[in-house]
């Protein structure tokens, strides 16, 4: 493309009309950079109607009409077959509803990559205020029958923002219940197809999907998942020289077993981390140690990060970030950063400590006026010390917090109601 960005193609299936516009995630943003092409693209339109591929079409204007894209009765149309074009697609309300019906009745009529596209496009269109957030959420209902990696990954990555915004609020209970309901069949599918987790799926995508199934099932309270990871970890604790956990599953099993466990599990993992000879294995354990749900354990771990004899200096930032990614550790790290900024800056300012990543991570969940105030105060209090590589990140964090506040205000009530109704 010879101009910035990409288009969203809007389809009106009642008339067969296509239109294109420059896709902007933030509808309030102004594009100041002019384009000699006026943000109009030549778009290759591939499509399927009711599961059957149609002839290709080129959209060369802002608007065009073609009977390829008009439907009647229960027919639906889907654009950008196998996502070969770099554009998003929005439909009229009726076509969205028909696509959702098709997905829930027989999702195999829609190619796997398009099932992911439908989810991803809808969440982005909701962010851009083009469709209601409930439409994007409705597009995840079919996942109860989905076994493929890409659609699940599209949903989980979109919902990760919802988790960040709501995992400290009353929305999180119904959200967890919904995800638990949706992921349980996927979890059982992999349990049955891997001889109770003793084998690994042959297909690489299925291997990824298995990891998603375990991490989503465990983090959303599927009891059998919690028992499975705790059991595997206990086996390892009983025989430390023989790790029974397949390398594919280690990150997620370690993390969830430590989250479920207490001091004993944590201390064992710490010991294994200290004795690890493979960097890869050490990194998995170091990240998993931040998964504990015990505040005092996380606090102790946080203190370890500033002791180079325990955590290497070059690993300090990523370890602190792992702790802040844990909702229980987030407040802890923010207090720590506010109280120790001067020391952090003076001790680590010249080295590999990434202030930018740290500020970005510790403020990711910020979505209240109080947190915005705290952030502004933090900026004011440390102006003299400075923020080094984190200066730009701090400005971005202030902007992002404002955007988060606005998003939560707009969506919290709707999302709470939707998850409550759909987790039954």
């Amino acid at each position: 493309t010879l101009q910035m960005g990409f288009p969203v193609i809007t389809v009106d299936t009642s008339t067969g009309t296509l239109s294109q516009e420059h896709f902007l995630l933030d509808p309030d943003s102004n594009v100041t950079r002019p384009s000699e092409f006026n943000y109009v693209w030549i778009v290759p339109i591939t499509s399927i109607r009711d599961g059957r591929q149609q002839q290709d079409y080129w959209l060369i204007d802002v608007r065009a009409q073609n009977d390829l894209f008009s439907t009647s009765g229960n027919e639906w149309v889907l654009l950008n077959l196998n996502v070969t074009g770099y554009y998003r697609v929005n439909y009229d309300e009726e076509n969205w509803r028909k696509i959702q019906t098709q997905l829930q009745r027989d999702h195999s009529a829609i190619p796997v990559i398009n099932r992911a596209q439908i989810i991803n496009d809808a969440f982005n269109l909701a962010s851009a205020h083009k469709v209601p957030v409930t439409l994007a959420l409705n597009n995840t209902l079919f996942l109860i029958e989905e076994r493929q990696y890409m659609p699940w990954e599209a949903a989980l990555s979109s919902l990760s923002y919802f988790k960040l915004m709501f995992d400290r609020s009353e929305v999180y209970g119904p959200m967890k219940n919904y995800l638990k309901k949706q992921v349980t069949p996927l979890f059982i599918h992999f349990r049955n197809n891997t001889n109770n987790w003793r084998e690994i799926p042959e297909n690489l995508m299925d291997q990824y999907s298995e990891v998603n199934a375990i991490s989503t099932a465990c983090s959303n309270g599927v009891p059998e998942c919690e028992e499975m990871v705790s059991g595997l970890f206990k086996q390892w604790m009983e025989n430390p020289n023989n790790n029974p956990i397949h390398p594919n599953l280690r990150s997620t099993v370690y993390c969830n077993a430590i989250a479920q466990g207490g001091e004993e599990e944590w201390d064992f993992a710490w010991e294994q981390f200290r004795n690890a000879t493979l960097v890869n294995e050490a990194d998995k354990l170091r990240a998993a140690l931040a998964c504990s749900k015990e505040l005092w354990i996380l606090n102790r771990y946080l203190s370890y990060t500033l002791n180079p004899d325990l955590i290497r200096k070059q690993d300090a930032t990523s370890t602190i970030i792992s702790i802040t990614n844990n909702v229980i550790g987030q407040g802890l790290v923010w207090d720590f950063v506010q109280s120790n900024w001067k020391k952090l800056f003076n001790d680590y300012g010249g080295g590999s400590f990434s202030f930018s990543n740290l500020i970005q991570a510790v403020t990711r969940r910020f979505s209240t006026e109080y947190e915005l105030q705290q952030l502004e105060q933090f900026k004011k209090d440390n102006e003299e010390t400075g923020f080094g590589s984190g200066t730009r990140a701090l400005e971005q964090a202030l902007e992002k917090t404002k955007a988060n506040i606005k998003w939560v205000k707009e969506n919290k009530e709707v999302v709470l109601q939707w998850f409550t109704e759909n987790s039954k």
Epitope: D92, E93, H129, K130, V131, E413
Partner: nanobody
Framework: QVQLQASGGGLVQPGGSLRLSCAGS????????MGWFRQAPGKEREFVAA????????YYSDSAKGRFTISRDNAKNTVYLQMNSLKPEDTAVYYC?????????????????????WGQGTQVTVSS
């Protein structure tokens, strides 16, 4: 700040027609369901018609069915109520309302009295 401004009311003879408009501002109009309610003197506010966010779902009260048509223009942030074959019993103040909780429009049927976002009313009088 969500704002709704209804207009188009007036005095009309029985059998006549009126078209009410309601302009929305301060919110993402195109992702909300919109509806019309009315309140006759001494009576409770009652549901008249509703339309989903994209316009493909419409709902009517029994008294409005066949005579009234609800439509919307998302480009103009406006919802309309075309009223034909008006009767004296249609005399009321007509209010428009917005609902983001159920963008498909069914919220107006289930819990019309719980809608938070009401517009200013417009008076419709049907009399000879």
């Amino acid at each position: 700040q969500v704002q709704l401004q209804a207009s188009g009311g007036g005095l009309v003879q029985p059998g006549g027609s009126l078209r009410l408009s309601c302009a929305g501002s301060g919110f993402t109009f195109s992702t909300y369901a919109m509806g019309w309610f009315r309140q006759a003197p001494g009576k409770e506010r009652e549901f008249v018609a509703a339309i989903s966010w994209g316009g493909s779902g419409t709902y009517y009260s029994d008294s409005a069915k066949g005579r009234f048509t609800i439509s919307r223009d998302n480009a103009k942030n406006t919802v309309y109520l075309q009223m034909n074959s008006l009767k004296p019993e249609d005399t009321a103040v007509y209010y428009c309302a917005a609902d983001k909780l159920r963008p498909n429009g069914t919220g107006f049927l289930a819990r019309g009295t719980m809608i938070e976002t009401w517009g200013q009313g417009t008076q419709v009088t049907v009399s000879s």
